[in-house]
């Protein structure tokens, strides 16, 4: 079952080349989701971004850049605990059909060795829509800084929709958030991948409604085990 991805509200273009592990998952030429390069063969994204086949854009902040690498991928592995009903365990590994060429513009993301605490400033990035509910898709990668929010504070907003492997981030009284097209993309804190864009309130950018992310630090064992198993 396919689902459309998500984009960045109230952000700005990322500093060029500052996110060399950021990828776009395309369906044909159309943006489907974001993702991150874990190593030369693997991309990590959200489970709700599942498709039969992917075209992976790497190595350029600009979608459609002819200098970018485009690699097909036809194998993907959802977390076995992913639920389309509760949206828990919303992560998936996509295996590239051929290896990515690492360079200054194509680098592996650092997986976390610990879970960062509430209050930590992080950056979320993506090519998702910059407007909502009507969409405006940028060609350049967008970034916005947000802060991690405690589960207790986030539960006040989302109540029983929030599960313990979900991570919330936002800025009080601000529109800064991810949106359609950003799904599966990275939330990076202190140089490590802490979250993958999972879901949030629509229309996007409603003040005091945090973005919800898959908390990557809870899944490093599954990520490493899955890549080993399907080498």
């Amino acid at each position: 079952e396919e689902a459309q991805g998500d984009k960045i509200i109230d952000g700005a273009p990322c500093a060029r080349g500052s996110h060399p592990w950021q990828v776009a998952l395309l369906s044909g030429n159309q943006l489907h989701c974001g993702g991150v390069l874990v190593n030369e063969r693997w991309v990590l994204t959200a489970a709700h971004c599942k498709m039969n086949e992917y075209t992976v854009h790497l190595g350029s902040d600009t979608l459609g850049d002819r200098r970018a690498q485009r690699i097909k991928a036809s194998k993907s592995f959802r977390h076995p605990g992913y639920s389309t009903q509760t949206h828990v365990n919303d992560l998936m590994l996509v295996k590239l059909n051929s290896q990515a060429r690492l360079s200054s513009m194509v680098k592996k993301v650092r997986l976390p060795s610990r879970c960062e605490p509430p209050g930590t400033t992080c950056t979320v990035s993506g090519w998702g829509t910059t407007t909502s509910p009507d969409v405006t898709f940028p060609s350049d990668l967008m970034c916005v800084d947000v802060k991690l929010i405690s589960p207790q504070d986030c539960t006040k907003v989302y109540k029983d929709l929030l599960e313990n492997s979900m991570l919330c981030a936002g800025i009080p009284d601000s529109k800064k958030n991810a949106c359609n097209g950003d799904s599966g993309g990275p939330l990076v804190c202190r140089g490590t991948l802490q979250g993958l864009v999972s879901w949030g309130t629509f229309p996007c950018g409603q003040p005091n409604d945090p973005g919800v992310y898959t908390q990557v630090c809870k899944f490093t064992k599954w990520i490493n085990d899955t890549m080993k198993k399907h080498r």
């Epitope: 689902a3 459309q4 489907h32 959200a46 919303d90 309130t201 629509f202 996007c204």
Partner: antibody, heavy 128, light 108 residues
């Protein structure tokens, strides 16, 4: 202003397939985050949700009708369609197309949406 | 499937009356409830979503409240244009979207 308009035959024979199209004007199906759905209302009765589709083609059907329903989208024509097979007199109803406004984006989007814009409806009678 | 039960099925009222319609869900739907108004021969029109959020362009005399399993639609001062049938709809479950049976508001 967004408008939806249903079209299709008003009379269908039993056991045949009912086919309806909804044309969207004043906005583009392919450049939005909305869902597009079909609801029906038998004469003198209440409303029944048939199913919905996202612009990317993800479909969600009422389990009671799932085996007979197909909803598809044609973004180039800004239309979405309903096909209901093996119809009987019980399928006689006014059929409405509507836009579904999601409450969330991303993983949670397709479970929480309400119908905020409706077409005028088209009457379909199943009779030989 | 989640069943939605509306009461009363018919309500007789006069212009200026305060009118309350109740909708009960067979299980908790949090605040995922919408209210629609339908006039004879016309399509339903969205009034309220997320239990209490007023749709743009809808008069402020309409209000919604409730959460969990019990919800109400209130018309603070009934106007001639408000005589119609009202439906609640739950959209907060993994089962299909379901509507209540309707409440017809008629002139007393």
């Amino acid at each position: 202003q967004l408008q939806l308009q249903e079209s299709g035959p008003g009379l269908v024979k039993p056991s045949e397939t009912l086919s309806l199209t909804c044309t969207v004007s004043g906005g583009s199906i392919s450049s939005s985050s909305y869902y597009w759905g079909w609801i029906r209302q038998p004469p003198g009765k209440g409303l029944e949700w048939i199913g919905s589709i996202s612009y990317s083609g993800s479909t969600y059907y009422n389990p009671s009708l799932k085996s007979r329903v197909t909803i598809s989208v044609d973004t180039s024509k800004n239309q979405f369609s309903l096909k209901l097979s093996s119809v009987t007199a019980a399928d006689t109803a006014v059929y409405y197309c509507a836009r579904g406004a999601p409450t969330y984006f991303g993983a949670a989007s397709h479970y929480y949406y309400y119908m905020d814009v409706w077409g005028k409806g088209t009457t379909v009678t199943v009779s030989s | 499937d989640i069943q939605m039960t509306q009461s009363p099925s018919t309500l007789s009222a006069s212009v200026g009356d305060r009118v309350t319609i109740t909708c009960r869900a067979s299980q908790s739907i949090s605040s995922w409830l919408a209210w629609y108004q339908q006039k004879p021969g016309k399509a339903p029109k969205l009034l309220i979503y997320k239990a209490s959020s007023l749709e743009s362009g809808v008069p402020s005399r309409f209000s919604g409240s409730g959460s969990g399993t019990e919800f109400t639609l209130t018309i603070s001062s009934l106007q001639p244009d408000d005589f119609a049938t009202y439906y609640c709809e739950q959209y907060g479950s993994y089962s299909p979207l379901t509507f209540g049976g309707g409440t017809k508001v008629e002139i007393k």
